[in-house]
């Protein structure tokens, strides 16, 4: 899964459905797989925020051991801390579980910065605020790690929700969601509503706050407004999609659309930022700078290295442009666009300036591994991972942060030709996709 500004995410926890709530619109939608409507038991089952990740409570073993697990759509292993670590409040103790089975196999996962390694086994797993089922799932018991767990993050493991192709050590290790669908009647679909707080949260606020919802097996209509628009999953490894056009404040970046997907575009809840390929990043920043030229900010800000601070409540949102990504639609020559606000791509950072200041980090960054639609994108939307129909749906999130002038948007259809040409075909080599 992409590291660097990639998982583990950095900075604090929490994030509640705050800011202005949009009115509910009633739109009819095509029939969805699985249950629809209300999933009261699963709503608000996530805590966290974009900087350090969103986590769900899970239980592992018999008797059940409760752990907080980071929800990561950019990887495919279920891995939990299984040995003492200075940043862990608790960890999985295999010796205390009567249902643990050792697979007698190790696993090693390196990142650009850091790594984790552990021992593979299986055990009984359930999600208290999820479907009322228990499954036997593969678990990587992390025995050693470096720069993986985050001090104060409050999560002890990671739930990789992507496909088997990118599982470690290889694709024969069945991911948790595959096991869940195989062993139960849970439909092959999940949806995520990640709620950015819009302002920094201290540790106590985080632990008391709601960070969003992971609806397993369906779609909850209370979590979004307007219509769901779907884009095909190009290939089942990461949740790969195709971006066909990018606009900054309505101005087309006018790049060959292949550049937007070089070498792939993925939806990844385990990445903090919107990460863009080098050429696209440079063009986007140039355009954002031009749009916000009534002020000038240091280069370090655009590199995500420096924070810009304004007196509390005076952040000039209006000088920053909206960013629209056009995604391939389900119908030939049809696309739709998702639009995010500066409230999504300027990430509030706690604890740095005075209490009378609001400080932000620019949460768009450069990537050498393609576009990564991370938490800053996902915080604007309710995102449906419809694995059964090999598609991803986007609708405006009921908890996204906005102001009285602009809101995030999902709009379409738009006529776009030759969208298939926007996909990049990665040369088939046995390279490690995780070493990024």
């Amino acid at each position: 899964t992409q590291h660097g500004i990639r998982l583990p995410l950095r900075s604090g926890l929490g994030g509640a459905p705050l800011g202005l709530r949009l009115p509910r619109e009633t739109d009819e939608e095509p029939e969805e797989p699985g249950r629809r409507g209300s999933f009261v038991e699963m709503v608000d089952n996530l805590r966290g925020k974009s900087g350090q990740g969103y986590y769900v409570e899970m239980t592992v073993g018999s008797p059940p051991q409760t752990l907080n697990i980071l929800v990561d759509t950019g990887s495919s292993n279920f891995a939990v801390g299984a040995a003492p670590h200075p940043f862990l409040h608790r960890y999985y103790q295999r010796q205390l579980s009567s249902t643990y089975r050792d697979l007698r196999k190790g696993v090693y996962v390196p990142y650009t910065q850091g790594k984790w390694e552990g021992e593979l086994g299986t055990d009984l797993v359930s999600i208290p605020h999820g479907p009322n089922v228990t499954v036997r799932a593969n678990i990587a018991a992390i025995t050693e790690s470096d720069k993986f767990f985050i001090n104060g993050s409050n999560w002890e493991g990671i739930l990789g929700l992507a496909y088997a192709e990118i599982a470690r050590p290889d694709d024969s290790l069945e991911p948790f969601f595959d096991s869940l669908v195989k062993q139960t009647h849970v439909p092959n679909l999940f949806s995520l509503q990640l709620c950015g707080a819009g302002f920094p949260l201290n540790q106590s606020e985080v632990l008391a706050s709601v960070g969003g919802s992971m609806i397993i097996g369906g779609i909850d209509h209370s979590l979004y407004t307007g219509s769901l628009w779907y884009t095909p999953i190009r290939r089942e490894w990461y949740y790969e999609v195709i971006i066909v056009r990018v606009e900054i404040n309505g101005q087309d970046l006018k790049m060959d659309c292949k550049e937007y997907n070089y070498d792939k575009s993925i939806v990844d809840s385990g990445t903090t930022n919107l990460r863009l390929p080098k050429k696209v990043f440079e063009a986007a920043v140039k355009s954002i700078k031009a749009a916000s030229s009534t002020e000038k900010f240091p280069d370090g800000f655009w590199l995500g290295e420096q924070l810009v601070c304004w007196q509390a409540g005076t952040t000039p949102w209006n000088i920053f442009p909206v960013i629209s990504l056009y995604l391939m639609g389900e119908v030939t020559n049809q696309s739709f666009r998702i639009t995010i606000l500066p409230q999504q791509y300027l990430r509030p950072v706690e604890d740095v300036a005075t209490s009378q200041d609001d400080c932000y980090k620019f949460a768009i960054s450069q990537s050498s591994t393609g576009t990564v639609m991370g938490a800053v994108i996902m915080e604007g939307f309710y995102v449906v991972f419809d694995r059964a129909r090999k598609r991803i749906g986007f609708a405006v999130s009921a908890c996204h942060v906005h102001d009285e002038f602009r809101t995030a948007a999902v709009e379409g259809p738009f006529v776009t030709l030759d969208m298939e040409d926007c996909g990049y075909n990665i040369p088939q080599t046995d390279e490690s996709t995780l070493m990024t």
């Epitope: 000038k296 240091p298 420096q306 601070c309 740095v352």
Partner: antibody, heavy 120, light 108 residues
Amino acid sequence: QLQLQESGPGLVKPSETLSLTCTVSGGSISWSSYYWSWIRQPPGKGLEWIGSIYRSGRTYYNPSLKSRVTISVDTSKNQFSLKLSSVTAADTAVYYCARVGHGINYFDLWGRGTLVTVSS
Amino acid sequence: EIVLTQSPATLSLSPGERATLSCRASRSVNSYLAWYQQKPGQAPRLLIYDASKRATGIPARFSGSGSGTDFTLTISSLEPEDFAVYYCQQVYTWPPRTFGGGTKVEIK
């Protein structure tokens, strides 16, 4: 060679408004991508940032002084100004104007400073 | 709020000696830190920026090091004109505003 020069009264009565002007010579405020700042230093003490302004008129102020400070720019005169209202003896200081350069991060050019005493 | 603490408050040295001044930030400021020199009756002068880069016209005897929370200004061999007050300033949080309390380098 760009130079900065502060000007204004050296004595201000308590509760009145302190007004200073910084004249930029050797270059144009309107065409340069710098922020222009005011910094003060009470006698025998350290440096305190008051605020900064961009050519567009966008300002940033020290939160502790915000309610009393106004910084403005006059590009036609190549000047920027400081007004500090309701002054007390605690506002007695040497007031410097400075340019924020080096990637708009650091105060790379300073005026000589002007001592303003608040006294009745 | 990021607080910059300079130490020692006063450093008594003789010309030709090496001076080592410390600036500690209450949390990481990456490498966004500068050092200024101020002589009596004069405005401060930028010496070092981005923790280790010398400003234009600054002699090579001045060097800066450090990143994160701990920074050092070193004057390899003190000249008579180096006796002054030195301030550090962080700009991890922008706009630039936070200065340390200063270190006075005086003749022993």
